[in-house]
Structure formats: structure tokens, C-alpha cells
Interface confidence: medium
């Protein structure tokens, strides 16, 4: 069954683009596009503030988790990465960079360290971390 | 610094789409698009043959790893998923569904089980597995 002839015959048929196919974006060049949001994983380690600045310089923000359904690609992300979630000491809430409050049931918040910033980890977990610690980070751009 | 007002002011500026932005695809609806390839992660567990059939029914194939640079999003994939790599017992080589040979320096092949199929795991690892074992799988479509 594994002959190259057989395998080639499976894949050398001309395929019409079905009507269900569509373009995604627009996104910055070489970013990941999913459900019309743009994501990029940066593997240089920066503290939260530097990570935020890096995303901003690319007309983006640090990752905002707003929907398990629209962002289900995040389930499979390995490792820990800065996202745009910060602790507001005055009222004890967790907010995104745009000022919106973290919705319930989106992230499981885990206190790894004392801190006011959060790392995203697979399966919608948020690890509290000191904002000055260098980590990789995820930038996100909502398409216009 | 973390006041909602401050954070809002950062992100509520009108942003022009830079010329470096572009559309990705076309891809099947709700697939991930990256560097003009389309990917989808399926979390129903199927054996290799069923996984292949599922991808084919969507005008796609199981994941083919052909470039660390063009497919660097795969570095961060968590867990194990069927890809389109199969062992050809007659000559001992590993081939993709389209009959092409696995290029060196792309995957670290790890013998987890005796088998003729391979699971993709993060950081470009390929785990040998019995083709009949159910696993989640990754479909891929090269854009036209």
C-alpha cells in the first residue's frame, strides 16, 4: 500500500478550491492567522514591559484571551509566554491592556510567583509571574 | 501605571494597515493559516488510516514537515499528533504521503513503539508508532 506510485496517485489529482475556502487577515507578514486574528510567538526572552513594547511597535498588543472557541488554537501551545493580562492592585482585578476585565471561565489563574503579570500556558492557563522576569511572549493583532 | 485609562489610551488609537500586512490563504474555513499553508488540529482520536482519510475528505493531507523555517509554528505544538510520514519496509526509508523522502535535519526520529507511522511532537520530533493506535492528528493543505 505504501508504494510511491499509490501515494502519488492519491495526491496528484487536480483539486478545485471549494466555496468554503477563504482568506484570513490581513496580518503582518509571516504571522499566524486564525479566525481573522493574527498571532506571533517571539522566542527572545523579554520582561513584560519590553514584551508589550515589542508588540506595540508592530501595531499589536500582547495576547488577549477573549474566547475559548475563537482561540482554540491556544489549547495546544507549549511552554509559557507573556500575555497582556495585568493585576490592578488598587481593586484586585485582572485586566487586559485595553482595560477590559478578565472574563470568568476563560483562564485558570495559577499563582506561580508573587507578581502583577501573567504568562499564558497551554489549555487556557494563566500563571502569575513577576513582571520583571524575562519570558518569551505572544503578540496578537485583531484584524481591522 | 495599570489604570484602565492609561491602557485604553495606548490601544484606542486609529491604526493604518501597514503595507507589510497581507492576507493568508485561501484555507478551509476556520483553519490556521501560516506562511500560506493551512493547518488544522483535530482532537478526535483516530488511527493513522482514518486520520489520513479524514484529511483527504477535506482536500488536505496529513501534516508534511518540509521546512523548519516555513513551519516554525510547529515548534510550539503540545502533545502528539499523527502526521503523514510512513515507513517503507522494502527500502527502510521514511516517506511522506506524496511519495517524497523525509529530508535530513527536519525531524528527530524517536522509536517510541515498533511501527510504520509517525506522530509529530513539539520541536520537530517524530515518534514512531503503530499505525493502528488512535491519536489526534494534524491536517495540512498547501495553498494553491
Amino acid at each position: 500500500i505504501w508504494s510511491a506510485v499509490f501515494l502519488n496517485s492519491l495526491f496528484n489529482q487536480e483539486v478545485q478550491i471549494p466555496l468554503t475556502e477563504s482568506y484570513c487577515g490581513p496580518c503582518p507578514k509571516n504571522w499566524i492567522c486564525y479566525k481573522n486574528n493574527c498571532y506571533q510567538f517571539f522566542n527572545e526572552s523579554k520582561n513584560w514591559y519590553e514584551s508589550q513594547a515589542s508588540c506595540m511597535s508592530q501595531n499589536a498588543s500582547l495576547l488577549k484571551v477573549y474566547s475559548k472557541e475563537d482561540q482554540d488554537l491556544l489549547k495546544l501551545v507549549k511552554s509559557y509566554h507573556w500575555m497582556g493580562l495585568v493585576h490592578i492592585p488598587t481593586n484586585g482585578s485582572w485586566q487586559w491592556e485595553d482595560g477590559s476585565i478578565l472574563s470568568p471561565n476563560l483562564l485558570t489563574i495559577i499563582e506561580m510567583q508573587k507578581g502583577d503579570c501573567a504568562l499564558y500556558a497551554s489549555s487556557f492557563k494563566g500563571y502569575i509571574e513577576n513582571c520583571s522576569i524575562p519570558n518569551t511572549y505572544i503578540c496578537m493583532q485583531r484584524t481591522v | 501605571i495599570w489604570s484602565a485609562v492609561f491602557l485604553n489610551s495606548l490601544f484606542n488609537q486609529e491604526v493604518q494597515i501597514p503595507l507589510t500586512e497581507s492576507y493568508c490563504g485561501p484555507c478551509p474555513k476556520n483553519w490556521i493559516c501560516y506562511k500560506n499553508n493551512c493547518y488544522q488540529f483535530f482532537n478526535e482520536s483516530k488511527n493513522w488510516y482514518e486520520s489520513q482519510a479524514s484529511c483527504m475528505s477535506q482536500n488536505a493531507s496529513l501534516l508534511k514537515v518540509y521546512s523548519k523555517e516555513d513551519q516554525d509554528l510547529l515548534k510550539l505544538v503540545k502533545s502528539y499528533h499523527w502526521m503523514g510520514l510512513v515507513h517503507i519496509p522494502t527500502n527502510g526509508s521514511w516517506q511522506w504521503e506524496d511519495g517524497s523522502i523525509l529530508s535530513p535535519n527536519l525531524l528527530t526520529i524517536i522509536e517510541m513503539q515498533k511501527g510504520d507511522c509517525a506522530l509529530y511532537a513539539s520541536s520537530f520530533k517524530g515518534y514512531i508508532e503503530n499505525c493502528s493506535i488512535p491519536n489526534t492528528y494534524i491536517c495540512m493543505q498547501r495553498t494553491v
Epitope: - | G92, P104, N105, L106, T108, I109
Partner: antibody
Framework: QLQLQESGPGLVKPSETLSLTCTVS??????????WVWIRQSPGKGLEWIGN???????HYNPSLKSRVIISVDTSKNQFSLKLKSVTAADTAVYYC???????????????WGQGTTVTVSS | DIQLTPSPSFLSASVGDRVTITCRAS??????LAWYQQKPGKAPKLLIS???TLQSGVPSRFSGSGSGTEFTLTISSLQPEDFATYFC?????????FGQGTKVEIK
């Protein structure tokens, strides 16, 4: 003991095609564990990887030469070949055919080399 | 393309000396780095790859270390037959690239 031997003209005129052949002895060129490679060395550019070929014919080329280079394999003669089109003086170099050390689908350097053949591009 | 920068490009040493050559990659290449020795009129000879693994038949006075972007070749006690040019090569991604070489000469 695997041995490689380059052959071909030592002098090529500008704008012509450089053609070299590498004959493999002591092993089969179609062994599934072997890839084959061309590398050149010039005083100006040092060592430069030209490209690789697998016994099945699949290739990888240096992007800087891709538009001018063809590497092919002839399993019946146990040979692989290099053609470099539209040569200039900058292509003057010692050309080596070689075999990369390949283990578990990873390249670990080039462990068998031909003795090299000097090609001069001049009218 | 990944650039490899050797240091120094020229080295003058005596028999018995400990010699260290460095190769810096323009981006991370894990441990996919090879070291070669070349004598005049001869093809390069593979000494070490990946990064720290000595090839069979290579004397134990040669050793390699490093990962990512910084790599080192060390000859613990230089012998007369070690006077040659040493090259590094990255095999992390195509196109494969080589450093310009470090020439080790007799002082």
C-alpha cells in the same frame, strides 16, 4: 571503504557550462542512508556548499547558485554530476564531491570527500 | 543565510601549546556545528560533529564545546601534524555555510 573521484575539464570558458562527474566506489550510490553533496573552495569565497542530492533524485541547492545549478544522479553508473551554467571567473575554484555523515535523519558534517578538482574559468 | 565568524583568523603557536578557536553563528544553530581540519592541497577532514562529538580516529587532544551561537574547538597539546587550517560549518539549515577558517601556524 567508500571513495569518491571527481572528473571533468579543468578549463571552462566564460558563459559556458561547467560539468563535473563524481564516481562512487566501495558502496552503492542508491543506498537509502546516503546523500551526496558538491562543495567548492576558492581563495575569495572560502568553502561554499553548492547542493545535495539523494539517490531518489531529490535535491537541495544553495539559493545563491540555484538558478544556474543542476545536480543529478545516475544509479546505473554509480555516479552523480554537477552542471553549473553561465560560468564567470568567480566560479574558478576547487570542486569537491562528498558524502555527508547522516544518522537518524540528521546531517552531522561531511565525512567522505573526493580529492577535489581544480576548475579555472578563463577564455 | 547563517553567517559563521571564526576567531582568530590566524594563530601562531608552539608544539605543546593549548589552542582555542572560536566560531560564532549569526543565529542559534542548536548543536549542529562541525569542525574540519584542512592541510594544503588536501580535502577537509571532519574532526568533530555535532559540536562536541569526536569522530572516530580523531585524537583525543581535540575537543569541541558550545551550543546555540558560540562554539569552541580546543587542541589541548598542539602536535606538529596539527598545523593546518580549521573550519567550522553549520548544518542547522540550508544553505549550509562555512566559516572562513583559522590558520594555525608554527611560532
Amino acid at each position: 571503504q567508500l571513495q569518491l573521484q571527481e572528473s571533468g575539464p579543468g578549463l571552462v570558458k566564460p558563459s559556458e557550462t561547467l560539468s563535473l562527474t563524481c564516481t562512487v566506489s566501495g558502496g552503492s550510490i542508491s543506498s537509502s542512508s546516503y546523500y551526496w553533496v558538491w562543495i567548492r573552495q576558492s581563495p575569495g569565497k572560502g568553502l561554499e556548499w553548492i547542493g545535495n542530492i539523494y539517490s531518489s533524485g531529490s535535491t537541495h541547492y544553495n539559493p545563491s547558485l540555484k538558478s544556474r545549478v543542476i545536480i543529478s544522479v545516475d544509479t546505473s553508473k554509480n555516479q552523480f554530476s554537477l552542471k553549473l551554467k553561465s560560468v564567470t571567473a568567480a566560479d574558478t575554484a576547487v570542486y569537491y564531491c562528498a558524502k555527508p555523515l547522516l544518522r537518524d535523519y540528521y546531517y552531522y558534517g561531511v565525512d567522505v570527500w573526493g580529492q577535489g578538482t581544480t576548475v579555472t574559468v578563463s577564455s | 543565510d547563517i553567517q559563521l565568524t571564526p576567531s582568530p583568523s590566524f594563530l601562531s603557536a608552539s608544539v605543546g601549546d593549548r589552542v582555542t578557536i572560536t566560531c560564532r553563528a549569526s543565529q542559534a544553530i542548536s548543536s549542529y556545528l562541525a569542525w574540519y581540519q584542512q592541510k594544503p592541497g588536501k580535502a577537509p577532514k571532519l574532526l568533530i560533529s555535532p559540536a562536541s562529538t569526536l569522530q572516530s580516529g580523531v585524537p583525543s587532544r581535540f575537543s569541541g564545546s558550545g551550543s546555540g551561537t558560540e562554539f569552541t574547538l580546543t587542541i589541548s597539546s598542539l602536535q606538529p601534524e596539527d598545523f593546518a587550517t580549521y573550519f567550522c560549518q553549520q548544518l542547522n539549515s540550508f544553505p549550509w555555510t562555512f566559516g572562513q577558517g583559522t590558520k594555525v601556524e608554527i611560532k
